[in-house]
């Protein structure tokens, strides 16, 4: 009886797992084994497939053998007892087009309101993804455990913390890596749940500020109690994309180690032109407090982010109020190539009600004055990144007085 | 597969000094703390310090801290613990143990420990 | 230094019984636990971490629970390779710190 070829064969690829899956075509004949060769674009010889000769089931895994992922190959399978079927050509395929990504690793750390996530391929070197392994960016499901309302959090990188949890509560997670850049999709890791710990008696510091002094920055924060001791480290923030690097180290700043005050001041060649992340950690002594919020800490923003000038043109019943580029030393105007929010704080000069607009814009409308009326204003520049959270100082109070009630123009 | 391959027993006089020595193989070995622990005989367990492959970086046991000294040689993968002025309360099993991934925010518990290396303090 | 209270120091129980070991922290150590296990002559093994998390490989017999101060290390039905010595230890400040340690033994 002539053997039939095998059917239907299907090919999966998860990172350098290189699996194949076929059916028989005919279950009634028995003992009967299969076995594939390979063709290389531009060959014209076949190549036994090493890991896929003689196979008496309906998979094997070719991932040893060494294959050009950017290569199209072909492949063909026979069914083999006595005699052999006719060869089954598989459509060919390019293995990086085919490749799906793994489901990356995840280690979990827990705090009392928040989770640190670490997330790493899963393949670790990776052959098909060597030119991408920067490049991937990762998302993750949450849920409670005990609700199971889900939350995705999108295009987070390979540390990820989330905040504001509930203590002494299990969540739990599962991540999946994507690369954007060549439209791929990953498969999600298994589920890893964590509990978040007891409430930690000492809180972590909060609001953390950066400004420039002299040749200085001084970095201040809020705490809740006295008498601790605080440390201070930073990270460059372009390693959070890549931990594998062994650059990804939180480092203290020497000057900022068990400093006895809500603030320390170090010298600014401390840090290179730059991006980077700082946190502060409190301790009593006996107890530590978990990591404060990271914020992020530009070089060139913190030196140079100076409050705004502006010029107003009085009304009877509003002013206009035009902001212009801040002036250096020299009246030369500070080119700010980031997006600025402007904070216009505005009081009767006889008044202590201070009144606040918010705008993007650089001509800003105070309405609601009333007529020959002492009125003053000061601003200043936020940058829009919530992470930056940098703000400049306030720029000196101008005072003005609104024109009599008949002007409208 | 992870391992810790520790340097053999050794025997001191008081006043000496001793050099152990731990070699890592299968894992990316500036990317983990390395521990050190020592269990004197018949006793519990008792943490020395822990030094960064990747810059030296250490942390130690207050108790040691004069008198221990943690060393890397990055081209072996091998971490050196040198305990000086020994006494004989030194008399003990020295471990190396891998820590948390440096990386990590927290520390982490010891996942990999060397075979131990046997150090007497006789005269 | 963080003191670490292990209880029992020693504890004798047949093969199939449940055994519970527990240790107390001096201070909060928000799940930084450890629990290992040590036969004679032999390193010791890393068993559970985060308090919970049980280590690839270890058999599912073995369990880790608590919170704050107090941890608990269960054996759900002792085999005859579990009679061994057991430490837990915190990670969460250093100086790094050991209980004192609970012997198993065949009654």
């Known amino acids: 009886k002539n053997l039939k070829s095998p059917q239907k064969v299907e090919v999966d690829i998860i990172d350098d797992n290189f699996i194949l899956r076929w059916n028989r075509s005919d279950e009634s004949v028995g003992n009967v084994t299969f076995s594939f060769d390979y063709q290389k674009t531009g060959m014209d010889n076949w190549i036994k497939l090493s890991g896929c000769q003689n196979i008496t089931s309906t998979k094997c895994n070719f991932s040893s053998l060494k294959l050009n992922v950017y290569e199209e190959i072909k492949l063909r399978i026979r069914a083999e007892k006595e005699n052999t079927s006719s060869w089954y050509e598989v459509d060919s395929f390019t293995p990086f087009r085919k490749a799906q990504i793994g489901p990356p690793e995840v280690h979990l750390e827990a705090e009392d309101k928040a989770i640190v996530i670490h997330i790493s391929p899963g393949t670790k070197d990776s052959v098909m993804w060597a030119l991408d392994g920067l490049s991937f960016t990762y998302s993750l499901v949450i849920w409670k455990n005990s609700s199971g309302v889900e939350e995705r959090i999108e295009n987070i990188y390979s540390r990820h913390k989330i905040y504001k949890l509930s203590p002494e509560t299990t969540y739990c997670l599962k991540v999946k890596a994507a690369l954007l850049t060549s439209w791929k999709i990953g498969v999600y890791s298994p589920v890893h749940c964590i509990k978040t710990t007891v409430e930690n008696e000492l809180p972590p510091p909060e609001n953390i500020e950066v400004s420039v002094q002299n040749q200085n920055y001084v970095l201040k924060w809020d705490y809740t109690y006295a008498n601790m001791t605080f440390q201070v480290q930073w990270l460059h923030a372009f390693l959070k994309r890549n931990p594998g690097n062994h650059l990804y180290k939180w480092k203290q700043i020497p000057d900022c180690e068990n400093v006895k005050t809500t603030q320390c001041v170090f010298p600014q060649n401390v840090f290179q032109k730059g991006i980077y992340l700082l946190r502060v950690q409190a301790s009593d002594g006996n107890n530590t407090s978990f990591w404060s919020e990271e914020i992020k800490f530009d070089t060139e923003i913190q030196a140079f982010l100076l409050p705004p000038v502006f010029n107003i043109r009085s009304l009877s019943d509003s002013f206009h109020i035009y902001i212009g580029a801040p002036k250096q030393s020299g009246n030369t105007p500070v080119i700010q190539d980031y997006p600025l929010i402007y904070e216009i704080i505005f009081w009767e000069n006889t008044s202590n009600a201070e009144r606040k607009i918010i705008e993007k814009k650089t001509d800003v409308t105070v309405p609601n004055l009333k007529p020959l009326t002492v009125y003053c204003v000061k601003a200043r520049a936020h940058t829009m990144d919530e992470k930056l959270n940098k703000s400049s100082v306030f720029s000196d109070a101008v005072c003005e007085k609104t024109k009599p009630g008949n002007t409208s123009k | 597969q992870v391992q810790l391959v520790q340097s053999g027993a050794e025997v001191k006089k008081p006043g000496a000094s001793v050099k152990v020595s731990c070699k890592a193989s299968g894992y990316t070995f500036t990317s983990y703390w390395m521990n050190w622990v020592r269990q004197a005989p018949g006793q519990g367990l008792e943490w020395i310090g822990k030094i960064d492959p990747s810059d030296s970086e250490t942390h130690f046991n207050q108790k040691f801290r004069d008198r221990v000294t943690l060393t890397v040689d990055k081209s072996t993968s091998t971490v050196y613990m040198e305990l000086s002025s020994l006494r004989s309360e030194d008399t003990a099993v020295y471990y190396c143990?891998?820590?948390?991934?440096?990386?990590?925010?927290?520390?982490?518990?010891?996942?990999?420990w060397g075979q131990g290396t046997l150090v007497t303090v006789s005269s | 230094d963080i003191q670490m209270t292990q209880s029992p120091s020693s504890l004798s129980a047949s093969v199939g019984d449940r055994v519970t070991i527990t240790c107390k922290s001096s201070?909060?150590?928000?799940?930084?636990l450890a629990w290992y296990q040590q036969k004679p002559g032999n390193a010791p093994k890393l068993l559970i971490s985060g308090a919970t998390t049980l280590e690839s490989g270890v058999p599912s017999r073995f369990s880790g629970s608590g919170s704050g101060k107090d941890y608990t290390l269960t054996i759900s039905s002792l085999q005859p390779e579990d009679f061994a010595t057991y430490y837990c230890q915190q990670y969460w400040n250093k100086p790094f710190t050991f209980g004192q340690g609970t012997k198993l033994e065949i009654k």
């Open positions: 143990a891998r820590g948390g991934r440096i990386s990590f925010d927290y520390d982490a518990a010891l996942d990999y």
């Open positions: 201070e909060v150590i928000y799940n930084r």
